[in-house]
Interface confidence: medium
């Protein structure tokens, strides 16, 4: 009797997922000498152990604890950049501003960035056909639980002034349902974090509105203030110029507002 594989609504595991994770791990540890001690084979074994043979709708943060332990990394707690719905620009920024870090600049974030994975209950197979979709199937799936776990830990580690890059082109500039809105905001530690500074990135060249007055930003300010953390907000009207000025701060055109 053929055993019918569970059909999920989301895309299946990324092609050559094990190789990609292992290759990324080695590359990361080579580029970051402070992580040279990490045994990438053990990292892969721990990653695999978090979801293989488990029902892909029944994954817990505990499943990822062995991986979290192996990937423990100290980043400067006052140099953390969070982002929501504007990943590419955030990554371009930290590529230039090398002393600041997004989650994807850490080992665990780098390993999983843009990848999808899931297994099947009671078999050692990786499911390359389909994986659960967060909305249509279940929220406790391997990918969602992974990002919830690493995002929580990343936010908990932050201190002093924490920056967040937000997409001003979206209808909800601050979205309570995003990873930032549902996980990171609530795990910033008031005893360590003094200020959350939002950078609202404008999309249109002619957009001169003050998006810091947007209702969703006011909602974010309210949530943050209730947590005894100060809030500030800046409009980034010209993201291209912003990046250019990060690269060349002495440029004369960089004194004006960006």
């Amino acid at each position: 009797v053929p055993r019918w594989r569970q059909q999920w609504s989301g895309p299946g595991t990324t092609k050559r997922f094990p190789e990609t994770v292992l290759a990324r791990c080695v590359k990361y540890t080579e580029i970051h000498p402070e992580m040279r001690h990490v045994d990438c084979q053990s990292v892969w074994d721990a990653f695999k152990g978090a979801f293989i043979s488990k029902h892909p709708c029944n994954i817990t943060e505990e499943d990822y604890q062995p991986l979290m332990k192996l990937g423990t990394q100290t980043v400067p707690c006052n140099k953390i950049l969070l982002w929501s719905r504007i990943k590419d620009l955030a990554h371009q920024f930290t590529q230039v501003q090398r002393d600041m870090f997004t989650l994807e600049d850490t080992l665990l974030g780098y390993l999983a960035d843009d990848l999808t994975w899931c297994g099947e209950f009671n078999t050692s197979k990786i499911n390359y056909q389909s994986c659960p979709d967060w909305r249509k199937d279940c929220s406790n799936n391997p990918v969602s639980v992974f990002w919830k776990t690493v995002s929580r830990r990343f936010a908990e580690a932050a201190c002093d002034v924490v920056h967040v890059m937000l997409n001003g082109s979206r209808s909800k500039i601050f979205d309570k349902n995003s990873t930032f809105g549902s996980v990171e905001v609530h795990n910033l530690q008031p005893e360590k974090v003094q200020t959350l500074e939002a950078w609202v990135i404008h999309g249109g060249r002619e957009d001169s509105r003050d998006l810091c007055q947007d209702p969703t930003i006011k909602e974010l300010e309210s949530i943050i203030s209730k947590r005894n953390i100060q809030f500030s907000c800046k409009n980034i009207y010209r993201p291209d110029k912003f990046l250019q000025c990060v690269k060349n701060p002495e440029d004369s055109s960089c004194t004006s507002e960006i």
């Epitope: 292992l22 590359k27 990438c40």
Partner: antibody, heavy 121, light 107 residues
Framework: QVQLVQSGAEVKKPGSSVKVSCKAS????????ISWVRQAPGQGLEWMGG????????VYAQKFQGRVTITADESTSTAYMELSSLRSEDTAVYYC??????????????WGQGTLVTVSS | EIVMTQSPATLSVSPGERATLSCRAS??????LAWYQQKPGQAPRLLIY???TRATGIPARFSGSGSGTEFTLTISSLQSEDFAVYYC?????????FGQGTKVEIK
């Protein structure tokens, strides 16, 4: 048996570019890092950069950043190194070399035969 | 970047004698060090990796030692085919860097 076969010698004018290829056979091309190492006449070895074909994200030595482009084509198991804005000091034998372990960039256990690039006006 | 310094630049040895080559790193490279042999007109050949592990097919007369910043390659009894240039290379920190080489010549 792993073999790395490089393209033939090139003579180039200053300011131009050169693209050297390195075709691999045997082993899994995608998983082993390929590096490029050059050796000027009578001089030592100099690492230029490397790539894990599966990832397609090269890493370059600072000295060559902006002038060198390393790529890999998994479908043909071929790695490429392009060096632009050539000057006479770039006259050298250029080697491709494969990492000793899967996924790791070094040390190098397999080497191409070398490609002599001469830059002269 | 890590600077690798080899000494001596040239070593004159008689066949059958022992040769000792040194390599110093400007900062610790742990045991992530390799030794290569290169003969004129040929590509380098990996001899030792991990500071002390012989690569496949390398004769037992070649041995490596050291860790951190000081490394040694020893050829216990030089054969005629061992006269060549030897390079050390660190692969602990990007960019990988090589020493300037030690030429082992016939005395």
């Amino acid at each position: 048996q792993v073999q790395l076969v490089q393209s033939g010698a090139e003579v180039k004018k200053p300011g131009s570019s050169v693209k050297v290829s390195c075709k691999a056979s045997g082993g899994d091309f995608s998983l082993y890092a390929i590096s490029w190492v050059r050796q000027a006449p009578g001089q030592g070895l100099e690492w230029m950069g490397g790539i894990i074909p599966l990832l397609g994200e090269p890493v370059y030595a600072q000295k060559f950043q902006g002038r060198v482009t390393i790529t890999a084509d998994e479908s043909t198991s071929t790695a490429y190194m392009e060096l632009s804005s050539l000057r006479s000091e770039d006259t050298a034998v250029y080697y491709c070399a494969r990492g000793h372990r899967v996924y790791s960039s070094s040390p190098f256990d397999y080497w191409g035969q070398g490609t002599l690039v001469t830059v002269s006006s | 970047e890590i600077v690798m310094t080899q000494s001596p630049a040239t070593l004159s040895v008689s066949p059958g004698e022992r040769a000792t080559l040194s390599c110093r790193a400007s900062q610790s490279v742990s045991s992530n060090l390799a030794w290569y042999q290169q003969k004129p007109g040929q590509a380098p050949r990996l001899l030792i990796y991990g500071a002390s592990t012989r690569a496949t097919g390398i004769p037992a007369r070649f041995s490596g030692s050291g860790s951190g910043t000081e490394f040694t390659l020893t050829i216990s009894s030089l054969q005629s085919e061992d006269f060549a240039v030897y390079y050390c290379q660190q692969y602990n920190n990007w960019p990988w860097t090589f020493g300037q080489g030690t030429k082992v010549e016939i005395k």
